[in-house]
Interface confidence: low
């Protein structure tokens, strides 16, 4: 089964090659809207130094395999090379959100991207009713990514002094109220991203319409609107809307909950101070440590490494997990030196899968939580690749 492009087509996505000072605009179904790339460009690359933009992938020259999309062009790689054409290759992996296209590398001929997204999953378990892009680049080309805040079920309760109402929101997607562990959101209308509970009734006060926007280097904004349908009586004829402003704090701090800063005629303004609004390089590294210079905090997990010894064992319900944290690749898990996490099915010990690899390691410290992520594991039945936190 190929990638579900419909979910990605509604938006023009952005990726950045910061080393070469280039911005890519990506619309997997066609027009990225930049004139010099032409009307059928699916991937347009803009050189920030020269302000020149050129197409590196044409929507009319698209070919696809199950998890790979290739966009060719009619342009030769170099003036002297008329044989090979410039092309873009996007590898899709199943993810829990729409995700973001990540620039991997570029050669003279091929621009490579990787995209972990629900659009690539075999099963619909993570698919949202409505989801919008949840990241933005600042003018230093640093990525601000709120995808980790997206809830797959339920919502966030907004801190509000009104005892008669409770406002719940999700980030960049609708609230999946049916899968909410607490039953109170089950009454929320399907598709709402902002649900107001008043008495025993629930009102849809906003749905995601467009992606996350950057206001300044430390402020991001998301707007939910309710355009169709009848307006609740208490809105005094106004259409409900919710504006959520995410603020990167000026120094490291624990996480806070979203706070209602203003409301009038069903227009709700919410401010959320969260380190996820800061640029991603401030929050994470690909090693097992974070430094005071870059991350404003010093953390080193390398003492947890099991050099030459046995891995940590974690007992799950169906699986036993073997974990080699920040480890020495001489410790072979799943008979594979690349494996950082390995899972073995309890009912059948021959069923062994890599659940994360050393080369796909991310250490993240945000809102007081320290998370070590190993991705790039073997494929699951959902199409999802194993991914260990």
């Amino acid at each position: 089964q190929a990638v579900d492009l419909d979910a990605l087509c509604s938006y023009t996505w952005e990726a950045v090659d910061s080393k070469n000072n280039a911005v890519y605009k990506i619309n997997v179904c066609g027009n990225v809207g930049i004139s010099s790339c032409g009307p059928t460009s699916a991937i347009c690359m803009c050189d920030l130094k020269t302000e020149n933009c050129r197409s590196v992938g044409d929507s009319l020259l698209r070919s696809s395999a199950r998890s790979l999309l290739e966009f060719n062009t009619t342009m030769g790689c170099q003036p002297s090379d008329s044989q090979h054409r410039i092309q873009t290759s996007i590898t899709f992996l199943c993810g829990k959100t729409l995700g973001t296209p990540e620039f991997v590398t570029a050669t003279d001929c091929v621009h490579y991207f990787e995209w972990r997204t629900t659009a690539a999953c075999k099963k619909d378990i993570f698919k949202a009713d409505k989801e919008v892009p949840c990241y933005a680049f600042d003018d230093k080309l640093q990525k601000h990514d709120l995808n980790p805040l997206i809830k797959l079920n339920g919502g966030y309760l907004v801190d509000d002094s009104d005892p008669d109402t409770s406002l719940f929101i999700n980030v960049c997607r609708d609230i999946d109220s049916l899968r909410d562990p607490s039953t109170q959101l089950r009454v929320c209308p399907a598709g709402t991203a902002a649900c107001l509970l008043k008495g025993n009734q629930a009102f849809d006060v906003g749905r995601p319409k467009e992606g996350l926007k950057l206001l300044s280097k430390d402020r991001l904004v998301l707007t939910y609107v309710k355009e169709e349908g009848e307006k609740p009586d208490f809105c005094n004829g106004h259409s409900p809307a919710v504006t959520v402003t995410f603020v990167c704090p000026s120094e490291r701090r624990e996480g806070t909950i979203p706070k209602l800063t203003a409301k009038s005629n069903c227009r709700y303004e919410v401010e959320w101070i969260t380190e996820y609004a800061c640029h991603r390089d401030y929050l994470q590294s690909e090693s097992c440590s974070l430094s005071s210079e870059q991350h404003d905090i010093t953390i080193d997990l390398s003492p947890l490494a099991q050099y030459g010894g046995s891995p940590y064992v974690s007992d799950g319900r169906e699986y036993t997990f073997f974990i080699n944290v920040c480890g020495d690749t001489k410790v072979s898990l799943c008979n594979n030196k690349e494996a950082a996490v390995c899972q073995e099915k309890k009912a059948d010990s021959t069923q062994v899968k890599i659940a994360g690899r050393h080369q796909n390691q991310t250490l993240r410290y945000s809102d007081g939580d320290l998370t070590l992520i190993y991705s790039g594991g073997d494929e699951c039945s959902s199409g999802h690749h194993h991914h260990h936190h």
Partner: nanobody, 124 residues
Framework: QVQLQESGGGLVQAGDSLKLSCTAS????????GGWFRQVPGKEREFVAS????????YYTDSVKGRFTVSRDNAKNTMYLQMNSLKPEDTGVYYC?????????????????WGQGTQVTVSS
């Protein structure tokens, strides 16, 4: 230092057209990226369109693609926004902006100079 002044706003019916102008004073206009933004009361200013210093490359937000055209005449130190098939949701104060640093027009933040704004109202 670049000073910007918008003109051409007004009240029109849905479906009508309007052309906004932005005149710049200062010798460097031909070297800088130009942009148009709009704002409705109670909302943040939002990006509409931008044009590179040469005028070769233009970029539009999704909601105006195919309806709005940005252009510039460097000899006259002027940038334009031709708005066709206007909708009530296009109502707002339109600002022209300019950016001296040579960043991509695809980046919609980081503008250094701003005009005072001109009101566009589209009635249904």
């Amino acid at each position: 230092q670049v000073q910007l002044q918008e003109s051409g706003g007004g009240l029109v019916q849905a479906g009508d057209s309007l052309k906004l102008s932005c005149t710049a004073s200062g010798p460097t206009f031909s070297e800088i990226t130009g942009g148009w933004f709009r704002q409705v009361p109670g909302k943040e200013r939002e990006f509409v369109a931008s044009i590179s210093s040469t005028g070769i490359t233009t970029y539009y937000t999704d909601s105006v693609k195919g309806r709005f055209t940005v252009s510039r005449d460097n000899a006259k130190n002027t940038m334009y926004l031709q708005m066709n098939s206007l909708k009530p949701e296009d109502t707002g104060v339109y600002y022209c902006a300019a950016r001296s640093t040579s960043r991509s027009i695809a980046i919609t933040v980081g503008y250094d100079y701003w005009g005072q704004g001109t009101q566009v109202t589209v009635s249904s």
